[in-house]
């Protein structure tokens, strides 16, 4: 029963992570710039995202412009776009794998196969979390590097936008949710399927596999 509870918690966290990731990728708030002129009338905030940039005037009026040419975009922006989309698709794939192996579904009958599917979905969600983390950390690194670069003009310096924080939250939720799904499935090791099934039926697995066992450090 505890295992089922962890599974549900895990999938809820990954779903929240996926939604966060989607919002993070879609919102044009990756980089934020504040231009303050001599007069408060010309004060404006520029939001830059993966797909468009927006200018918010002091009056509250907002104008957004979708980036024109894909080929004219900086390579890091193209890479961030690609990684964001791939991360979201990978997480969706993870959800489908999970649904196939969930305790409450009948797609797969054998308990050991279900356990493997849930474990696989957990791993897929962890991969999605890492993929989400890469563009977010890369962008944050660039913003921070610019901030401390004395030759970058003040007007060119950016601040961390809300999308980056959402991206970090998304990545954390996907990693945590994926990790929980991995933990709900006991490791078969060298033992046969009968042992695996017997151990799967117990509520508290003797050996759990946490997210820390996956080499996420290589990606950050």
């Amino acid at each position: 029963m505890a295992s089922a509870g962890m599974q549900i918690l895990g999938v809820v966290l990954t779903l929240l992570g996926w939604v966060n990731g989607l919002v993070s990728c879609a919102l044009p708030m990756w980089k934020v710039t504040a231009f303050i002129g001599n007069s408060i009338v010309v004060a404006q905030v520029v939001w830059e995202g993966l797909w468009m940039s927006c200018v918010v005037q002091s009056t509250g009026q907002m104008q957004c412009k979708v980036y024109d040419s894909l080929l004219a975009l900086p390579q890091d922006l193209q890479a961030a776009r690609a990684l964001c989309v791939i991360a979201l698709l990978v997480a969706l794939f993870g959800l489908l794998v999970y649904l196939a192996g969930a305790k409450c579904t009948t797609c797969v009958e054998e308990k050991d196969s279900k356990a493997r599917l849930v474990l696989t979905s957990g791993i897929v969600f962890v991969i999605s979390g890492v993929l989400t983390l890469i563009p977010v950390c890369w962008t944050a690194h660039a913003i921070i590097r610019d901030f401390y670069n004395p030759l970058v003009a003040e007007a060119q310096k950016r601040e961390l936008g809300a999308s980056l924080y959402l991206g970090w939250a998304a990545s954390g939720l996907l990693l945590l949710g994926g990790g929980l799904l991995c933990c709900t499935c006991p490791s078969g090791g060298s033992q046969g399927p009968s042992h695996y099934m017997a151990r799967y039926s117990t509520s508290a697995p003797a050996i759990s596999r946490g997210p820390s066992e996956y080499p996420t450090k290589n990606y950050v």
Epitope: A142, N149, P150, L151, V152, A153
Partner: antibody, heavy 119, light 107 residues
Amino acid sequence: EVKLVESGGGLVQPGGSLRLSCAASGFTFNSYTMSWVRQTPAKRLEWVVTISSGGGRTYYPDSVKGRFTISRDNAKNTLYLQMSSLRAEDTAVYYCIRGDYRYDGFAYWGQGTLVTVSS
Amino acid sequence: DIQMTQSPSSLSASVGDRVTITCRASENIDSYLAWYQQKPGKSPQLLVYASTLLVDGVPSRFSGSRSGTQFSLTISSLQPEDVARYYCQHYYSIPYTFGSGTKLEIK
């Protein structure tokens, strides 16, 4: 009008010291990053040092680190470059440079002061 | 250190010609590149920053472009007053380095 006037250049023996000054006017001195860049007799440009607007952060290349020291007196609107353990390869025209709010890089250059290191 | 390889070292062209000076970085510098113009007997002046952005007051015949680690400064129609030495400079990381310069002359 932005005005940067360097002084203090001259002939110095290898191993000697020299202090360059840069008098700034026409802008709010304490709002800008300042730098020194030199131009060798072969016309090559070399970045020497940069200091933040408040003076709290300084940036040096390895070639001058430990030998050159940049400082600024925001009350006097003056930038300084203290050079010691001078070598023949330090012979160059030294330019005082102001950064800009809008533009990256070295935005405004002084007329330069010549430093010759020779025995 | 990042090396900036500038070419050609000297260039002679006629008034009205299209002139291109290139600068290649030894490693990735994103768009952290500036171009400077130094007229005879004068101090250098900033022309282009962030690889493509023109400083106010710089004639529109000047333009900057980037392709990976290769950067170009183009003068669409050479004018007599463009006779100068041109330098590229990266500001991606310390130490900031300049190209060796291109001396541009009129034929």
